[in-house]
């Protein structure tokens, strides 16, 4: 059985990184875009485009930047204070319950339903029953039941890199 609990000092060890900017921690914390040195004496800047930290922190390292997958587009690059922002390519979307991959949007609604919402990077097309106006469950209909409402953009599934 092993262990994370309370109070013991780290053996001091100086961090050798002369190419990175240093400053002193403020009340034991370093500003966004920095992490703390192994001995706790210095704040060391993150490397632009490689790693980042978003808040005041005492992290022992900056966090690695996310790399957008081939099925994604990069909305904004990684900076020292913000991670990369990736978005599913046109015609694909990422669901909350399966955030690790972009799924292809349906090209149309089942028979008897009408499209009320377009494919977006975060949602599939939205279908409702013509009469009742209730939402479709989101299950992909059989091909022969599909009523095409827009051509849709073919796209391959993608994995969210971590």
């Amino acid at each position: 059985e092993s262990a994370l609990i309370t109070q013991q000092d780290l053996a001091p060890q100086q961090r050798a990184a002369p190419q990175q900017k240093r400053s002193s921690p403020s009340e034991g914390l370093c500003p966004p875009g920095h992490h703390i040195s192994e001995d706790g004496r210095d704040c060391i800047s993150c490397k632009y485009g490689q790693d980042y930290s978003t808040h005041w922190n005492d992290l022992l390292f900056c966090l690695r930047c996310t790399r957008c997958d081939s099925g994604e587009v990069e909305l904004s690059p990684c900076t020292t204070t913000r991670n990369t922002v990736c978005q599913c390519e046109e015609g694909t979307f990422r669901e909350e319950d399966s955030p690790e991959m972009c799924r292809k949007c349906r090209t149309g609604c089942p028979r008897g339903m009408v499209k009320v919402g377009d494919c977006t990077p975060w949602s599939d097309i939205e279908c409702v029953h013509k009469e009742s106006g209730t939402k479709h469950s989101g299950e992909v209909p059989a091909v022969e039941e599909t009523v095409t409402s827009s051509p849709g953009t073919p796209a391959s599934p993608c994995s969210l890199s971590g």
């Epitope: 059985e1 092993s2 262990a3 994370l4 609990i5 309370t6 109070q7 013991q8 000092d9 780290l10 034991g28 703390i36 706790g40 922190n57 005492d58 992290l59 022992l60 390292f61 966090l63 690695r64 890199s161 971590g162």
Partner: nanobody, 126 residues
Framework: EVQLVESGGGLVQPGGSLRLSCAAS?????RYWMYWVRQAPGKGLEW???????????YYRDSVRGRFTISRDNFKNTLYLQMNSLKSEDTAVYYC???????????????????GAQGTQVTVSS
């Protein structure tokens, strides 16, 4: 009950290699960051390496970077540390630990070893 059982330590000559393992049980292993920490004789706990929950991101303290490799098998609930080019200053008891995020200075500074924790002894000596 959370259990972390380390193994694979031993006596090795400088320049030699060892592979440490940590068998985890009692929690959802794949949801947690995992660390290796060590305690040299008469010294405090020292963070060695960390790996995120999915295993895609690995981090090392400066003195072991390029020599040690951390990895995990989320199907076997096991954490590993491959230690190459060992030096006398790597001599310590090595422990694995679970956490909800990356290691911070304050977290490592306030870490202690549970009385029941065994760790695995690594001795580098000629």
């Amino acid at each position: 009950e959370v259990q972390l059982v380390e193994s694979g330590g031993g006596l090795v000559q400088p320049g030699g290699s060892l592979r440490l393992s940590c068998a985890a049980s009692g929690f959802t292993f794949s949801r947690y960051w995992m660390y290796w920490v060590r305690q040299a004789p008469g010294k405090g706990l020292e963070w060695v390496s960390a790996i995120n929950s999915g295993g895609g991101d690995t981090y090392y303290r400066d003195s072991v970077r390029g020599r040690f490799t951390i990895s995990r098998d989320n199907f076997k609930n096991t954490l590993y540390l491959q230690m190459n080019s060992l030096k006398s200053e790597d001599t310590a008891v090595y422990y694995c630990a679970k956490a909800e995020g990356p290691p911070t200075f304050s977290l490592i500074r306030t870490m202690t070893v549970d009385p029941g924790a065994q760790g695995t002894q690594v001795t580098v000596s000629s």
